[in-house]
Amino acid sequence: HNTTVFQGVAGQSLQVSCPYDSMKHWGRRKAWCRQLGEKGPCQRVVSTHNLWLLSFLRRWNGSTAITDDTLGGTLTITLRNLQPHDAGLYQCQSLHGSEADTLRKVLVEVLADPLDHRDAGDLWFPGESESFEDAHVEHSISRSLLEGEIPFPPTS
């Protein structure tokens, strides 16, 4: 799986979209999880409704919401009031039994609010961020991670 980068501005909302084959994943619930380390497990943040026929209902866990257009084949995750600690690698997943298929790997980048003059030293900016795909969704910019680009910030 390639990794798609979604950039959002601190304090604003970021929408992440994960397209999928609606027929292949028919009847399957979806989830959004956060990758813990490069080889670590993916920790569930939020999942769609327990009843697949109600997957379109927005479900929240804290500041993260998920909704699934099961006919159109698009899972949408909203990160409200984006914070620096939200930056990192995530996955959109399709669930079946105790198994989970990865629909998309997502790198969330948090950019400083240009109107916020406080110290931006705690914001993490990855190295390569000049080349963008033109996928713009509500304060978000997405692109594919460049080959060789590290999806995790270096640890000091």
Epitope: W26, L51, W52, L53, L54, R59, W60, L71
Partner: antibody, heavy 126, light 106 residues
Framework: EVQLVESGGGLVQPGRSLRLSCTAS????????MSWFRQAPGKGLEWVGF??????????EYTASVKGRFTISRDGSKSIAYLQMNSLKTEDTAVYYC?????????????????WGQGTLVTVSS | DIQMTQSPSSLSASVGDRVTITCQAS??????LNWYQQKPGKAPKLLIY???NLETGVPSRFSGSGSGTDFTFTISSLQPEDIATYYC????????FGGGTKVEIK
């Protein structure tokens, strides 16, 4: 007039089967999610399960206590929803209602049930 | 699973009184809550959907409010025809009903 009429209830022995029907009229049946509920004598309401509209390929969902025993199906040509009940238990004794899910658009609905049938009594007893 | 606690389980009020019923969810259910009226021997009738929306054709004396875990159903002026049992129903987790509130006339 929008209407739902249930039929097929009656007395049945434990372990046996029964099929309930819910005949719809006055609306485009294929466009709606149809649900079954039950109410044991003197008790509250319990959701049994539902079946998606034609757009959702008649996908079904059930409450845990009936999963594997009850099956919901639909026949669009006759505007009928069915509840096939197998391996019946005494605790399945109840009035069974079918109901229509409220529809917002072609794809979106809400599990607020805006049209109900009159109910049919199922008694499971030896 | 989410538990829906409805209170009171029964109440007696006079015609013209303001009647309030509450429904408490064991966890946050946003506004995913409906209210129904059931008269003896009859099927339930939808009154309020999505916590506060009045169903078409339902008298305006009925109203609903709340979000998160605490919800309220109000009859602003009780009428003789309102004698019934009222149920809340959540759909955040599965489809679960409260235990019901039986409303009687004093």
């Amino acid at each position: 007039e929008v209407q739902l009429v249930e039929s097929g209830g009656g007395l049945v022995q434990p372990g046996r089967s029964l099929r309930l029907s819910c005949t719809a009229s006055g609306f485009t049946f294929d466009d709606y999610t149809m649900s079954w509920f039950r109410q044991a004598p003197g008790k509250g309401l319990e959701w049994v399960g539902f079946i998606g509209s034609k757009a959702y390929s008649a996908t079904t969902e059930y409450t845990a206590s009936v999963k594997g025993r009850f099956t919901i199906s639909r026949d669009g040509s006759k505007s009928i929803a069915y509840l096939q009940m197998n391996s019946l238990k005494t605790e399945d004794t109840a009035v069974y209602y079918c109901a229509r899910g409220k529809r917002y658009s072609y794809t979106y609905w809400t599990p607020a049930f805006d049209v109900w049938g009159q109910g049919t009594l199922v008694t499971v007893s030896s | 699973d989410i538990q829906m606690t409805q209170s009171p389980s029964s109440l007696s009020a006079s015609v013209g009184d303001r009647v309030t019923i509450t429904c408490q969810a064991s966890q946050d259910i946003t506004n995913y809550l409906n209210w129904y009226q059931q008269k003896p021997g009859k099927a339930p009738k939808l009154l309020i959907y999505d916590a506060s929306n009045l169903e078409t054709g339902v008298p305006s004396r009925f109203s609903g409010s709340g979000s998160g875990t605490d919800f309220t159903f109000t009859i602003s002026s009780l009428q003789p025809e309102d004698i019934a049992t009222y149920y809340c129903q959540e759909y955040d987790s599965y489809i679960t009903f409260g235990g019901g509130t039986k409303v009687e006339i004093k």
